[in-house]
């Protein structure tokens, strides 16, 4: 295929791939029909003068992963072609003034992942086409106002995982076509007014894990198209009220590790489009009536590892749309009976590691197509009559670790566990805590006549269709319906995932599918 | 329907303690939030706290905290609010008041006239 | 806590007139308003909630609107059995608290 070099492999799509320890340099003869080129995981330290300069056709250029830490000013010259460049994974600390000169139909530019200390507003002047710019994962600490001026066709900005402590308000200024700004894993503590108002398209903002305390309350006012917002895993202790306020399209928000003691009332809107809301781990104390309520098509609502001990019963109101409720690991002693009330859609309810004493008998009547319900680790000792009863779809409901009192009113509870075990999993089954001489006993199987020999039974009306047998043994070990796999945060959508984190540490997290938090 | 009742007038001498009781009926008593509010006369209204009937967990505003003491008892649907330290001031018209599908306060008690008079 | 700051303290007006009684609070409280009607001798009635839901069985001459600081209820047409004392109140954040009231009475 023109001349391969040895050290490559040619395929016919004039494909060029090189790789392998034994490069120290730009293999050549290149065929000059090349269209893409990789050059991986070499120990090429330095780019020359004009390595590709018998290659003008070539549209993509892959030099990742190799020990490169030097690269001359006209080492792309010749690349009139050129709209894909990564240099992604090399061991660049400067980049020498130029180098992109002549690049006139790049699209792509990928530093991400080098030791780049600084970047000037010269280094990407000539690069007008670009429409992506990659600079995650290096150690640039701060951006010089013009630095972007002239890439006004930008549509993805990656700035994360450097060391930033402070954006100017102006650096993004002429980039109204970008959709795709990510700032995470920076040490920004504050963000100035301003600093978005040009991003007029801009779809989707990361800045979590940085180190922000305050929002500006009309940080996002200009921002009408975003869709995702991710503030995650900063210092955030109070929200303005209206700083979600111009936010129509936003359909993922993430406020997980911050230090939220309250929510503002009205803060979430309106936002008809929002589907996921994460406020895990935060310090949120109670969630007081409508504090939702513009959040109509909410599909997903975490708010577990706060310190919730009051909910309103109005709490909830406007969520009609809600799958999924995580309240796990809260304070919770007790909930009004009307407080899921308005939740007619809800699939997945984790309450555990909570203070329940006890349940309202209609805690789920209206909460028809519920299909998983998680009580483990309360202070239970029994439920209400009947309810579950209604709850057709039930697959998936965690009693263990309660205290559960096994006297004479906890038969209609254990008839009907007795006829619906397979719903409570293989792993771990309720056990009676009291009295003292049933301690530790299955309650599925418990005969009640032994634990309160001195009571005469009466005759409990029993949960609908389920007789009481006595000494039932248990049924066979059935596997649980639905597992309790547990994402950290969000899949966050990225394309360069930086920083999905995927764990199955059931001990910690407990929850059903999508109840991440 | 959903009923309060509360027990009849009390006259109290400065610096004793008076109870007031409110019967419920009309639905589940433990599964739902129990307030008591005050009306001095010709004056408006002041909320003092809450009672989960369930768990007997209470609160109670800051003005009244060390003062009030809200209890239940299961058996009967009744909620207690018992205020020492009796003044002048304390002399009101109190109400039992149950919140609905949101943290406002949708059933009354008939209300307790408590007057605080040496 | 929360100041609830309701004007006028009274009003009089005649049956068929239009009533408008306002209600501030110190701070935001999003739309967690109740409006209350209160007869001599006799507890409060709930109006609305929800700064403009009605209560069931209220009539529909009584209405109210507002979120965050600033809150109105309008009495559309006032009637006879009107005439009596309206409570504004807050319930976003403990403790719960009350407007002064307003008293409506014939003129």
């Known amino acids: 295929y023109h001349g391969c070099p040895s050290e490559c492999t040619c395929s016919r799509a004039s494909q060029v791939e090189c790789t392998g320890a034994r490069i120290v340099a730009v293999p050549t003869p290149l065929p000059w029909n090349a269209m893409s080129l990789q050059i991986l995981n070499t120990h090429i330290t330095e780019l020359n003068e004009s390595p590709f300069l018998n290659i003008s056709a070539l549209i993509a250029l892959r030099i990742e992963k190799n020990e490169l830490s030097r690269i001359t000013p006209g080492a792309f010259r010749n690349l009139g072609s050129l709209r894909y460049l990564s240099l992604a994974n090399n061991k660049l600390q400067v980049l020498p003034i130029g180098l992109f000169q002549g690049l006139d139909s790049l699209e792509s530019l990928l530093l991400s992942s080098n030791q780049l200390l600084q970047i000037q507003p010269a280094h990407f002047s000539q690069c007008s086409n670009l429409k992506e710019l990659q600079l995650h994962g290096n150690h640039l600490e701060y951006i010089p106002d013009g630095a972007f001026d002239h890439l006004v066709g930008l549509t993805k900005l990656n700035l994360g995982k450097n060391s930033l402590t402070h954006i100017s308000p102006r650096v993004f200024q002429h980039l109204g076509n970008l959709q795709v700004l990510r700032l995470y894993e920076n040490r920004l503590t504050d963000i100035p007014m301003g600093t978005f108002d040009g991003l007029v398209n801009l779809q989707e903002l990361a800045l979590q894990q940085n180190q922000i305390g305050l929002l500006s309350p009309g940080l996002f006012h200009n921002n009408h198209n975003l869709q995702r917002l991710y503030l995650s895993n900063n210092h955030i202790s109070q929200l303005p009220p209206s700083v979600f306020m111009q936010l129509p399209q936003l359909n993922r928000l993430t406020l997980f590790g911050n230090s939220l003691k309250e929510l503002s009332p009205g803060i979430f809107g309106p936002m008809p489009n929002l589907r996921e809301l994460w406020l895990y781990d935060n310090h949120i104390s109670s969630l007081p009536d409508n504090v939702f309520s513009n959040l109509r098509q909410l599909q997903v609502l975490i708010l577990s590892r706060n310190q919730i001990s009051f909910i309103s019963p109005g709490a909830f109101n406007g969520l009609t749309e809600l799958r999924e409720l995580s309240l796990h690991t809260n304070a919770l002693q007790d909930l009004d009976g009307n407080v899921f009330r308005m939740l007619a859609n809800l699939q997945n309810i984790s309450l555990q590691n909570n203070r329940l004493r006890q349940l309202p008998g209609n805690i789920f009547a209206n909460v028809n197509g519920l299909m998983a319900i998680q009580l483990q680790n309360n202070q239970l000792e029994n439920l209400p009559l009947g309810i579950f009863d209604h709850l057709g779809k039930l697959c998936e409901l965690r009693l263990y670790d309660n205290p559960w009192r096994c006297d004479s009113d906890i038969l209609p509870l254990r008839n009907w566990l007795l006829l619906n075990q397979p719903r409570l999993g293989t792993d771990t089954v309720p056990v009676c805590f009291s009295p003292a001489n049933v301690r530790g006993q299955s309650l599925i199987i418990i005969n009640v006549n032994v634990a309160v020999p001195s009571v005469h039974v009466p005759e409990v009306p029993s949960y609908p269709e389920t007789p009481w047998y006595p000494d039932t043994p248990s049924y066979p070990d059935t596997t649980s319906v639905s597992s309790t796999t547990e994402l950290t945060s969000p899949v966050e959508d990225y394309t360069d995932l930086t920083t999905i984190q995927v764990t199955d540490d059931r001990s910690v997290w407990g929850m059903t599918q999508a109840q991440s938090g | 329907q959903v009923q309060l009742v509360q027990s009849g007038a009390e006259v109290k001498k400065p610096g004793a303690s008076v109870k007031v009781s409110c019967k419920a009926s009309g639905y589940t008593f433990t599964d739902y939030y129990i307030n008591w509010v005050r009306q001095a006369p010709g004056q408006g209204l002041e909320w003092m706290g809450w009672i989960y009937p369930g768990s007997g967990n209470t609160k109670y505003a800051q003005k009244f905290q060390g003062r009030v003491t809200m209890t239940r008892d299961t058996s009967t649907s009744t909620v207690y609010m018992e205020l020492s330290s009796l003044r002048s001031e304390d002399t009101a018209v109190y109400y039992c008041a149950r919140w609905g599908y949101g943290a406002y306060f949708t059933y009354w008690g008939q209300g307790t006239l408590v007057t605080v008079s040496s | 806590d929360i100041q609830m700051t309701q004007s006028p303290s009274s009003l009089s007006a005649s049956v068929g007139d239009r009533v408008t009684i306002t209600c501030k609070a110190s701070?935001?409280?999003?739309?967690?308003v109740a409006w209350y009607q209160q007869k001599p001798g006799k507890a409060p009635k709930l109006l609305i909630y929800?700064?403009?839901y009605r209560s069931s069985g209220v009539p529909s001459r009584f209405s109210g609107s507002g979120s965050g600081t600033d809150f109105t209820l309008t009495i559309s047409s006032l009637q006879p059995e009107d005439f009596a004392t309206y409570y504004c109140?807050?319930?976003?954040?403990?403790?719960?608290?009350f407007g002064g009231g307003t008293k409506v009475e014939i003129k």
């Open positions: 109140q807050q319930y976003n954040a403990f403790p719960y608290t």
């Open positions: 929800s700064a403009s």
């Open positions: 701070q935001n409280v999003g739309i967690n």
